[in-house]
């Protein structure tokens, strides 16, 4: 039975701190629980965004949460890769990246997540119901595919800023919380000042000045943190799925790169034709909630089924568990 749990990002307790053992004993059950309940459960997340700054601009991000190591990622649209979908990009850890119009830039974000930017082709409105799918071939778990599309509430006409990255949720909560306390403090000080004076307080225009200034201060750090933490993805235009696109093709085996559909602008010239996009180095990338995960651990390289010529040079990651939503 597959289960999942949501746990906070854990950091090792600092040595010598008072109560470190107590902290460790509290953390240990959570770690064990996470390992138990998420073991052997692959999960794929797909994020589709249409930036408000430019109509019809799409950025697709996909990630794999599981114990295996990624051997291949295929991004398609119009449906799953094996059920009528059209291949947009294929990312391989060793051979690099292949992409076909309207895909403009596909890249690895981490060792288990990718992003794809779509290129415009002159249409004025997006296909709101376009489905984008990501297929992760992992070893030893197999191939796992998930699809996503724009949420129903997406409206390109709205001038609201793009949804901040999920990692901002905790930050914004803290910032807004502190701002709320400051606002309350300002109001309370005003109240004390008024009470302290024997004569009526002068008109300070509280409805215009006092509440708005703290409110502006409360919003400013939110915007600043959005600017600082929001992942900088370029925005582009795209149209509904063009009929001229190549249909999905199988890939695998020794001539994998050569068997992929050939687009005029991306004619393969052997393995060198692959964009040599390096995979990000393993780091302390720890995020929370929406399709975010912690990376750690090493195992020897391996080969995936059907991809015997392409060992994964990175080594699989330690077990990564999915986090709950909302």
């Amino acid at each position: 039975m597959r289960t999942e749990a949501q746990v906070p990002a854990l950091q090792p307790p600092e040595p010598g701190l008072e109560g470190a053992m107590g902290h460790r004993t509290l953390v240990l059950p959570w770690v064990l629980l996470t390992l138990c309940v998420t073991a052997g459960t692959p999960e794929v997340w797909v994020q589709v965004r249409m930036e408000a700054t430019e109509l019809s601009s799409f950025t697709i991000r996909c990630g794999f949460l599981g114990s295996g190591s990624i051997s291949l990622v295929t991004v398609s649209w119009g449906g799953p890769n094996g059920a009528g979908g059209t291949t947009l990009a294929v990312l391989h850890p060793e051979r690099g990246i292949r992409q076909w119009a309207p895909a403009r830039q596909a890249r690895w974000e981490t060792q288990s997540s990718i992003s794809l930017i779509l290129e415009g082709s002159g249409a004025s409105s997006p296909c709101a119901n376009t489905t984008f799918c990501c297929k992760f071939a992992s070893f030893p778990e197999g191939s796992w595919e998930a699809c996503g599309s724009l949420p129903p509430s997406s409206d390109p006409g709205l001038s609201a800023p793009p949804t901040p990255a999920p990692i901002l949720r905790a930050d914004l909560a803290g910032i807004l919380g502190v701002s709320g306390v400051l606002l309350f403090g300002c109001v309370y000080l005003l109240h004390l000042l008024r009470r302290h004076k024997h004569r009526p307080a002068p008109r300070l225009q509280p409805s215009r000045t006092s509440p708005q200034a703290p409110r502006a201060r409360a919003w400013a750090p939110s915007q600043a943190s959005q600017a600082a933490l929001h992942v900088p993805y370029a925005t582009i235009n795209t149209s509904c799925r063009p009929a001229t696109l190549d249909t999905a093709h199988p890939h695998g085996g020794p001539s994998w790169w050569a068997s992929l559909p050939t687009h005029a602008a991306h004619r393969p010239q052997g393995p060198a034709a692959w964009a040599s996009t390096p995979i990000p180095a393993r780091g302390s990338f720890v995020s929370v909630e929406n399709g975010l995960y912690a990376q750690a651990g090493e195992r020897p390289p391996h080969t995936g089924p059907g991809l015997t010529l392409f060992p994964d040079p990175r080594g699989p990651r330690a077990m990564e568990g999915p986090l709950g939503v909302r």
């Epitope: 039975m1 597959r2 289960t3 999942e4 749990a5 949501q6 309940v37 999960e43 794929v44 997340w45 797909v46 994020q47 589709v48 965004r49 796992w144 595919e145 998930a146 699809c147 996503g148 599309s149 724009l150 949420p151 997406s154 949804t163 999920p166 929406n290 399709g291 999915p322 709950g324 939503v325 909302r326």
Partner: nanobody
């Protein structure tokens, strides 16, 4: 109340494919999770796959035993999901149930938050 209607089941030969569909109707506004479970003859109900929506991100989880043979995906309106089943084997024979609900926090089991269930559709894999 949410009503779920499954379709797409039937008889298929080993190695074949089927696509199950689940349509939700009624008060689906707060629904943010849909999934599939199955019950094979003489066995307990088991989790197959589930999809969760959270803003612009979709999470799809699968039972490990599938080994990537099944793909679950949903329509943008969040009221319909499809289970694409490839390389079907006799052991996949079961009644497949669609489930839906709302997950407002951590979910500790696949059927957590699954308040609504369909009547099921039978998938038979046999030569």
């Amino acid at each position: 109340q949410v009503q779920l209607v499954e379709s797409g089941g039937g008889l298929v030969q080993p190695g074949g494919s089927l696509r199950l569909s689940c349509a939700a109707s009624g008060r689906t506004d707060s629904m943010n999770v849909m999934g599939w479970f199955r019950r094979a003859p003489g066995k307990e109900r088991e989790f197959v796959a589930r999809i969760k929506w959270n803003g612009d991100t979709t999470y799809t989880a699968y039972a490990d035993f599938l080994k990537g043979r099944f793909t679950l995906y949903g329509a943008v309106a969040r009221n319909r999901v499809y289970l694409q089943m490839n390389s079907l084997q006799p052991e996949d024979t079961a009644v497949y149930y669609c489930a839906a609900g709302e997950v407002s926090g951590s979910s500790y089991s696949p059927d957590y938050g699954m308040h609504y269930w369909g009547k099921g559709t039978l998938v038979t894999v046999s030569s």
